[in-house]
Interface confidence: low
């Protein structure tokens, strides 16, 4: 509306005293704000209310600009040094005043729910008879829906520091800097931060894989808090390897150490199942003997099927868990004992007879010791310091200690062993991490498990 309009004296009095003293009555001219009639801003964020001074404004018009909340007589922002602004908007609302570029925009930062209102701009001069008043513009303040972003450069690797960045790129630079808080079970330290981001240095451990990491961002200017939680994907080398051994259709549970010896009956079917932790999963393969780095595996999976154990299978089998962060391998020694009817008589028969007699004798001694120990304590033995190990010469002249220490969930009743029960079955062997190229002499823990057929 271009027509001049008289303003009420009470409204104009505080600002136009010089004019009134000069005996002049102020006139108001209207101009339309460019852009939308309504703007939306999220709580805690910033918004710019665009405003351009009217093109009809004379270059010689020197004045002050004032932004008002509709219905209020105290401005929310002004460039007039003698004018007070509303307490609620002080420091948050700014008039971006540049008359040369005709700019009269209003900057709002740290938006609050109560800023939800209509605003207008007024231009007044102490030297001119008239002022300018803009059309109204509504500002809608909505709940904050943006959430922080957490970025990870590459993959988190166990034992190696990585910088995680929590960023809020949608936060305006001129707003009150947000407060960043991190929550994680992994070992961390705070790195540099900017208005829009915070860096956390994390040195994850294998146990931190799949745990939560949370970045929480609080906007103190508006009292709003947002957060984002991610699940850590930690790459780590295998820490332990387990071998499950299946003989026939039966399986029993054992814990054996590296290079453990396993007696197998000639002609028996044997299935060795290797499993390892590590992330991403380690590549599992089986080798016969102790393989060189570039050896060809006999199985490219974690499963090794031996349908009929014979002399060719006697010796060492190694499962290797290959991983970009480090490989782990464990070996198992098979020694085959032969069926009596499967051999010719004479010297060879005598040799095998003596071997089997010795083995049976040792087994009887071993089982007697296990049974005696079981009678003493029904609970699983946790500390094996007081157990006298039976020393048995291994297949390559190594000495293995057979110790009771791990018992099944349902231990068998002590009693005589029937002919049906004399075959022992073995499975699930856990090998805790062995440092590469530093072989340790380790104990082998056995316990008898009775299989009911």
């Amino acid at each position: 509306m271009q027509g001049a309009q008289e303003a009420s004296a009470s409204e104009m009095l505080p600002l136009l005293l010089p004019l009134l003293w000069a005996g002049a009555l102020a006139q108001e001219r209207r101009f339309q704000l460019e852009g939308p009639e309504s703007l939306t801003v999220q709580e805690g964020l910033c918004v710019l209310v665009p405003c351009r001074l009217p093109t009809t404004l004379p270059a010689s018009y020197y004045g002050y600009g004032y932004w008002f909340l509709e219905g209020a007589d105290v401005p929310v922002a002004t460039n007039d040094p003698d004018e007070e602004v509303q307490e609620e908007t002080r420091g948050r609302f700014h008039l971006l005043w540049d008359p040369r570029r005709k700019n009269c925009s209003l900057s709002i930062r740290d938006a609050r729910r109560r800023d939800n209102a209509a605003y207008f701009f007024r231009l007044k001069s102490k030297w001119m008879k008239y002022g300018y008043t803009s059309s109204k513009l509504s500002v809608r303040v909505m709940a904050l829906t943006h959430r922080p972003n957490i970025s990870i450069p590459g993959t988190l690797e166990s034992g190696h520091p990585s910088n995680l960045t929590c960023s809020v790129p949608w936060v305006c630079e001129q707003g009150t800097p947000p407060i960043f808080s991190w929550m994680s079970a992994a070992p961390t330290s705070l790195g540099p931060r900017t208005t829009q981001s915070s860096v956390l240095t994390i040195t994850p451990r294998p146990q931190d894989h799949s745990t939560n990491l949370t970045c929480q961002v609080t906007f103190p200017g508006a009292g709003v808090t947002m957060e984002r939680t991610i699940q850590l994907n930690v790459s780590y080398a295998p820490q332990k390897v387990a071998i499950s051994i299946f003989q026939g259709n039966s399986a029993a549970f054992k814990i054996l150490q590296n290079t453990s010896s396993l007696p197998v009956l000639e002609g028996q079917a044997l299935r060795l199942l290797c499993d390892a932790d590590g992330n991403p999963p380690a590549h599992l393969s089986w080798f016969q003997g102790f393989p060189a780095l570039n050896a060809t595996p006999i199985s490219n999976t974690g499963v090794l099927e031996l349908p009929q154990v014979g002399s060719a299978e006697e010796g060492d089998f190694t499962c290797r868990a290959q991983h970009p962060l480090g490989s782990l391998q464990i070996s198992l020694s098979l020694f085959v004992h032969w069926k009596p009817e499967g051999r010719a008589g004479g010297v060879l028969g005598a040799v095998w007879g003596a071997s089997i007699t010795t083995l049976v004798f040792l087994c009887v001694c071993f089982i007697f010791r296990v049974k005696t120990r079981r009678k003493k304590a029904a609970q699983p033995v946790q500390n094996t310091d007081d157990v006298n190990p039976v020393m048995v010469s291994g297949s390559r002249g190594h000495q293995h200690q057979f110790q009771t220490g791990i018992v099944s969930d349902h231990p068998a009743e002590a009693g005589p062993i029937s002919e049906d029960e004399q075959e022992l079955h073995y499975a699930v062997l856990h090998f805790h991490k062995v440092q590469p190229q530093e072989p340790k002499v380790t104990d082998t823990e056995y316990s008898e498990i009775k299989i009911h057929k």
């Epitope: 450069p153 590459g154 520091p161 970009p324």
Partner: antibody, heavy 117, light 108 residues
Framework: QVQLKESGPGLVAPSQSLSITCTVS????????VSWVRKPPGKGLEWLGV???????SYHSTLISRLNISRDNSKSQVFLKLNSLQTDDTATYYC???????????WGQGTLVTVSA | QIVVTQSPAIMSASLGERVTMTCTAS???????LHWYQQKPGSSPKLWIY???ILASGVPARFSGSGSGTSYSLTVSSMEAEDAATYYC?????????FGGGSKLEIR
């Protein structure tokens, strides 16, 4: 077992577009990023860009106007599209999976692209 | 962008000889994000050393890496025939992630 395999056109005329597909197996594209790297004949390796595990992308500043990297999670495929080819875009193009501490742990076998009329 | 310079561009060594190649970055790079790759003609690059000094799986112990800030190096303690290749250093510290021009190691 992690594997990546590139398939490209071999020969492209100048000013045309190059499209290469990288098919991956042994890992999920939603868990690991995939980068594109090229090696012009007689020159060194050059990183082109990456598509991160969350689908966001980063491009080399010199190629940002010509390069687009996208993916199809269901097909385990990552796509490179390079527009307005010049003869100096002749190179072997590799896709590589994002590994530990920003390494390229696994690489495809590469596909040679020659830009020539 | 961070410019990575490798020297020497070409070097030759006798079997059993100790070899060192260097990598210099135009601005500081975190040691966690400085890696080395080996490439032989007709093959894809292979991750060789990562995070400055950690040998990738299957890399012989005669290789080692060191450095910090802007200066890094790769050393072969005793040259073997199979070590003849081009070695690239690579920074993943800041995008764009850049490679050095490569150091070609030949057998004398």
């Amino acid at each position: 077992q992690v594997q990546l395999k590139e398939s490209g056109p071999g020969l492209v005329a100048p000013s045309q577009s190059l499209s290469i597909t990288c098919t991956v197996s042994g890992f999920s594209l939603t868990s690991y990023g995939v980068s594109w790297v090229r090696k012009p004949p007689g020159k060194g390796l050059e990183w082109l860009g990456v598509i991160w595990h969350d689908g966001s992308t980063s491009y080399h500043s010199t190629l940002i106007s010509r390069l687009n990297i996208s993916r199809d999670n269901s097909k385990s495929q990552v796509f490179l599209k390079l527009n307005s080819l010049q003869t100096d875009d002749t190179a072997t193009y590799y896709c590589a999976s994002d590994g530990y501490s920003g390494t390229f742990a696994y690489w495809g076998q590469g596909t040679l692209v020659t830009v020539s009329a | 962008q961070i410019v990575v310079t490798q020297s020497p561009a070409i070097m030759s060594a006798s079997l059993g000889e100790r070899v060192t190649m260097t990598c210099t970055a135009s601005s500081s790079v975190s040691s966690s994000y400085l890696h080395w790759y080996q490439q032989k003609p007709g093959s894809s690059p292979k991750l060789w050393i990562y995070s400055t000094s950690i040998l990738a799986s299957g890399v012989p112990a005669r290789f080692s890496g060191s450095g910090s800030g802007t200066s890094y190096s790769l050393t072969v303690s005793s040259m073997e025939a199979e070590d003849a290749a081009t070695y690239y250093c690579h920074q993943y510290h800041r995008s764009p992630y850049t490679f050095g021009g490569g150091s070609k190691l030949e057998i004398r």
